[in-house]
Interface confidence: medium
């Protein structure tokens, strides 16, 4: 006869491991007992369990409550056992020794591999600001056995670097993602992808990028100067900028206080019916936690009567 077993049995942490040992005997041969032992290199054999045809299943005190026979129906030639709730310390070499009649004793070894799935964590780097050089955007760490694979999934252009720390029964892998911050990266996802044989599917942790910036400011509303004349209603100036975090706006007048009746509404400066006293230099001040910008414009309110007078003079001069 001969023993049938597996070279390697792989199980995920917490699952039950079936340690196979089947005696394929000739007609009339009987299995009297099957002894299971842990036989790691450098250490003596430690009995795990013994299945006896007369006395039943014996379990070592060290494995009390954790070793069972597979559920019925059982083949009398099957010496397999179940190791419940596998832990990392169970990883190692096991030996199955079968005593038969009349053929004698047979033995076989297998290796139990206990996979420890990782629990990844993602840590964002320091605050990203436009204008910085190569900066750490995020780091992702995962520890498991065997060592997990850590990669990145993103549309953002950057560089990655990985390092690994080996522990006695596991390995921790840390991957860093570096980039040169730009405003186009704002709101873009940066996803850490962790692969491991103990996972049914890859684990993914997504970090949304936030890049602080402040665009140049400009003022709209003065495109047609001829519209800025005495008596005109609804005239307004709008300050244009964008930033992260969203900026706040402040309006001032360079050559004095804002005229009465002028309304400040965030990025918009609203005028009452125009008079010559609204002429002046207006400054839009844009700021956020990252930076500040100014833009100034000169408002020159035209007097239509003055203009028509000039035209008459010109006509008469001709």
């Amino acid at each position: 006869g001969e023993l049938e077993t597996s070279d390697v049995v792989t199980v995920v942490l917490g699952q039950d491991a079936k340690l196979p040992c089947f005696y394929r005997g000739d007609s009339g041969e009987q299995v009297g007992q099957v002894a299971w032992a842990r036989v790691d290199a450098g250490e003596g054999a430690q009995e795990l369990a013994l299945l006896h045809s007369k006395y039943g299943l014996h379990v070592s005190p060290a494995y009390e409550g954790r070793v069972e026979q597979p559920p019925p129906p059982r083949n009398p030639l099957d010496g397999s056992v179940l190791l419940r709730n596998a832990v990392q310390a169970d990883e190692g070499e096991y030996e199955c020794r079968v005593s038969t009649f009349p053929a004698g004793s047979f033995q076989a070894r297998l290796r139990l591999r206990v996979l420890v799935p990782p629990l990844p964590s993602l840590n964002p780097g320091p605050a990203l600001e436009e204008g910085q050089g190569l900066t750490l955007a995020a780091s992702c760490t995962a520890e498991g056995s065997p060592a997990p694979s850590v990669t990145w999934d993103t549309e953002v252009k950057g560089t990655t670097s990985s390092r690994s720390f080996k522990h006695s029964r596991s390995a921790a892998v840390t991957s860093e993602f570096h980039l040169v911050p730009s405003r186009s990266m704002n709101g873009q996802p940066l996803t850490c992808v962790v692969s491991h044989p103990g996972l049914l599917q890859d684990q993914r942790i997504t970090h949304i990028l936030h890049v602080s910036f402040l665009a140049e400011a400009s003022v709209r509303g003065l495109e047609d100067q001829n519209l800025w004349h005495i008596g005109r209603e609804g005239a307004m100036l709008k300050c244009l900028s964008e930033g992260q975090p969203p900026p706040s706006y402040n309006w001032t007048r360079l050559d004095g206080p804002l005229p009465s009746g002028v309304r400040v509404d965030g990025d918009t400066l609203g005028f009452p019916p125009l008079t010559t006293e609204h002429s002046g230099i207006y400054v839009c001040h844009v700021s956020n936690e990252f930076s500040s910008r100014d833009s100034q414009v000169t408002v020159d309110v035209l007097d239509p009567q003055e203009d028509s007078g000039k035209q008459v003079d010109l006509v008469s001069a001709s």
């Epitope: 007992q33 002894a35 054999a45 013994l50 014996h58 379990v59 005593s99 009649f101 004793s105």
Partner: nanobody
Framework: QVQLVESGGGLVQPGGSLRLSCAAS????????MGWYRQAPGKQRELVAT???????NYADSVKGRFTISRDNANNTVYLQMNSLKPEDTAVYYC????????????????WGQGTQVTVSS
């Protein structure tokens, strides 16, 4: 030839304890499985507990949690610690041991002791 001699039996009240010993005249190191059977008057002999050379144990459901089997290979002795004894534990307790045949062949040579009486009564 190995001889097994039991001791430690006696009369005990319900709820009490006894410790049985089984001393072997020769080395028990080669013993594959050692254990205790019991036989009450008019009943069949039943397996109580067994222990392997590596210290793995097996107990009858009726004694689980109350009886503990142990073995001291250095002193060639097997013990049965019996706690929370009940009247139905009254029986003659026999020590047994078996050895594998040559080259690990399963044709066990079984040794028996003469038995020791345990009586649980108030």
């Amino acid at each position: 030839q190995v001889q097994l001699v039991e001791s430690g039996g006696g009369l005990v009240q319900p709820g009490g304890s006894l410790r049985l010993s089984c001393a072997a005249s020769g080395s028990i190191f080669s013993m594959n499985v050692m254990g205790w059977y019991r036989q009450a008057p008019g009943k069949q002999r039943e397996l109580v507990a067994t222990i392997t050379s590596g210290g793995s144990t097996n107990y009858a459901d009726s004694v689980k949690g109350r009886f503990t089997i142990s073995r001291d290979n250095a002193n060639n002795t097997v013990y049965l610690q019996m706690n929370s004894l009940k009247p139905e534990d009254t029986a003659v307790y026999y020590c047994t041991g078996d050895q594998l045949g040559p080259l690990g062949t399963f044709s066990p040579i079984v040794y028996w002791g003469q038995g020791t009486q345990v009586t649980v009564s108030s």
